[in-house]
Structure formats: C-alpha cells, structure tokens
C-alpha cells in the first residue's frame, strides 16, 4: 500500500488503491458516525 492508518477500513482502501477522494469520504463519514455515537451516548 501507499501508507498507513489507524483506521482499518482506510488501510484496506489503500491496499485497493482507492482515490484520495474516496479515502476522504470514508474518513469524514467515520467522523460523522463517531460524533453521532457520542451524541447518543451523551443523551442517555
């Protein structure tokens, strides 16, 4: 691959030679998911 990441799904996408755009989409959607998860946790 062309680099490394602490996110397994991003690591896989690098192995699959994904574009910077698709990696960015994955990273941003993961962040959105985490924010939503923390929001749900905080509202319990």
């Amino acid at each position: 691959g062309g680099g490394g990441s602490k996110h397994k799904c991003v690591q896989n996408s690098l192995v699959n030679n994904e574009t910077l755009e698709s990696i960015m989409n994955t990273l941003e959607s993961e962040e959105d998911f985490r924010k939503y998860f923390y929001y749900l946790e905080g509202s319990k």
Epitope: G2, G3, G4, E21, L27
Partner: antibody, heavy 121, light 107 residues
Framework: EVQLVQSGPGLVKSSETLSLKCTVS??????????WGWIRQPPGKGLEWIGS???????FYNPSLKSRVTISVDTSKSQFSLRLTSVTAADTSVYFC?????????????WGQGTTVTVSS | DIQMTQSPSSVSASVGDRVTITCRSS??????LVWYQQKPGKAPKVLIY???RLQSGVPSRFSGSGSGTDFTLTISSLQPEDFATYYC?????????FGGGTKLEIK
C-alpha cells in the same frame, strides 16, 4: 485567509531526528475535506511528497520514507508535525508543509514558507 | 505508485512565445492532475487543478487540458514573470507523486 507557518531547526546532526512543526492560522485545522501534508525538495532538485495526515489522525506516508517518518496532528494547538529519524546527508532539503483538499482537487493550495534543513556530520 | 513523466525537462523561449509542457501518468488518473509554478526560493503555487481548472488569480494565458494519462499545460503568450519551473502532480491516489519539473528559461 489560511496561512501555514513552519518552525523547527535548520541544522540536524547525522543519525539524529529532524522535527518540524506547521501552525495553521486564519482557519481551522479541523475543517472538513482536507489533508495536511509535508513535501521536501533537495537542493536543485524536484518535489517529493513525504506524507499527509487527516484531522482524525489518519496518516499516509511515502513508502520510501515510511520506516523513518511520523506525522502527527494537535488540533487543540492547530498544529501538525513531522518527525524524520536517522537522518543522513540525503535528507538535506527544503521542507514545506501544505494543505490539500477537495476545493482544489487535492492540489496543495496553501504552503508554508519552507524550512531549509541541513544534515551535518 | 503512479509515475509522472514530464517533458521537456527544460525549454528556452522568448516573451510572447506559446509554450506547451506535457505530463504523462503511468496509470489512469482521470482528471486528478495539478500544475504548479515555482520560483527560486519560494514555495510552489497552484496554477491549474482538476487538469483544466484555472486557479483564482492566475492569468488566463495559462490553460490545462487532458484526462486519463496525458496532460498538457499551455502558456499562450509568455510574459517575463512566467520564467520559472513548472511541476505536475497526480492527486488521484497515495503516494502523491510529482513530475520531474520543467525549467522555463529566457532564450
């Protein structure tokens, strides 16, 4: 207007570690849609990408340097950093930090001023 | 890795000339191609992104074309301030890679 200001020593001893920082002003390092990267340019030569980081901390490195490079981000200080270990004379270069994102098809639209790093024996 | 081959490596031209620089990628990169201008002692500056989109503030004498593996930067009428080194860069996938550069010199 986003600006990048680089800091760090211009002289590093052979076999030691090069450390540089890049501080983002006039905007947020946490803005969505950007990678923050490091590029270097040996004297009289072309541009070489070292690596990039996303605000999440996910990193992407040049395979030729991967074993020696660490890039990290500190969103609270609006900074990202480069560490290059076990330097040799071949690492003597001008080092630039930069931002690349969706707005410009991932071209580096904002650059730091450049830091000339000389590796001495 | 995607290799970027830029040609020529240097070119001598006069003010008013039309100059064309080419860049070829070893794999299809669609339009994920950026052109930079660099002057001595300065950081590179984006001229063209997305293969053909002109960066704000860049004179219209600069244009970019191409898609896939073959790309061109054209300066329609050279001005004194255009004498510099030009680089292409693929922004399709990591690792990011640059062409070797084209030094544009005064004839």
């Amino acid at each position: 207007e986003v600006q990048l200001v680089q800091s760090g020593p211009g002289l590093v001893k052979s076999s030691e570690t090069l450390s540089l920082k890049c501080t983002v002003s006039g905007g947020s390092i946490s803005s969505s849609g950007y990678y923050w990267g490091w590029i270097r340019q040996p004297p009289g030569k072309g541009l070489e990408w070292i690596g990039s980081i996303h605000r999440s901390g996910s990193t992407f490195y040049n395979p030729s340097l991967k074993s020696r490079v660490t890039i990290s981000v500190d969103t609270s200080k609006s900074q990202f950093s480069l560490r290059l270990t076990s330097v040799t004379a071949a690492d003597t270069s001008v080092y630039f930090c930069g931002r690349h994102g969706r707005d410009y098809y991932y071209g580096m639209d904002v650059w730091g001023q450049g830091t000339t790093v000389t590796v001495s024996s | 890795d995607i290799q970027m081959t830029q040609s020529p490596s240097s070119v001598s031209a006069s003010v008013g000339d039309r100059v064309t620089i080419t860049c070829r990628s070893s794999q299809d990169i669609n339009n994920w191609l950026v052109w930079y201008q660099q002057k001595p002692g300065k950081a590179p500056k984006v001229l063209i992104y997305g293969a053909s989109r002109l960066q704000s503030g860049v004179p219209s004498r600069f244009s970019g074309s191409g898609s896939g593996t073959d790309f061109t930067l054209t300066i329609s009428s050279l001005q004194p301030e255009d004498f510099a080194t030009y680089y292409c860069q693929q922004a399709n996938s990591f690792p990011l890679t640059f062409g070797g550069g084209t030094k544009l010199e005064i004839k």
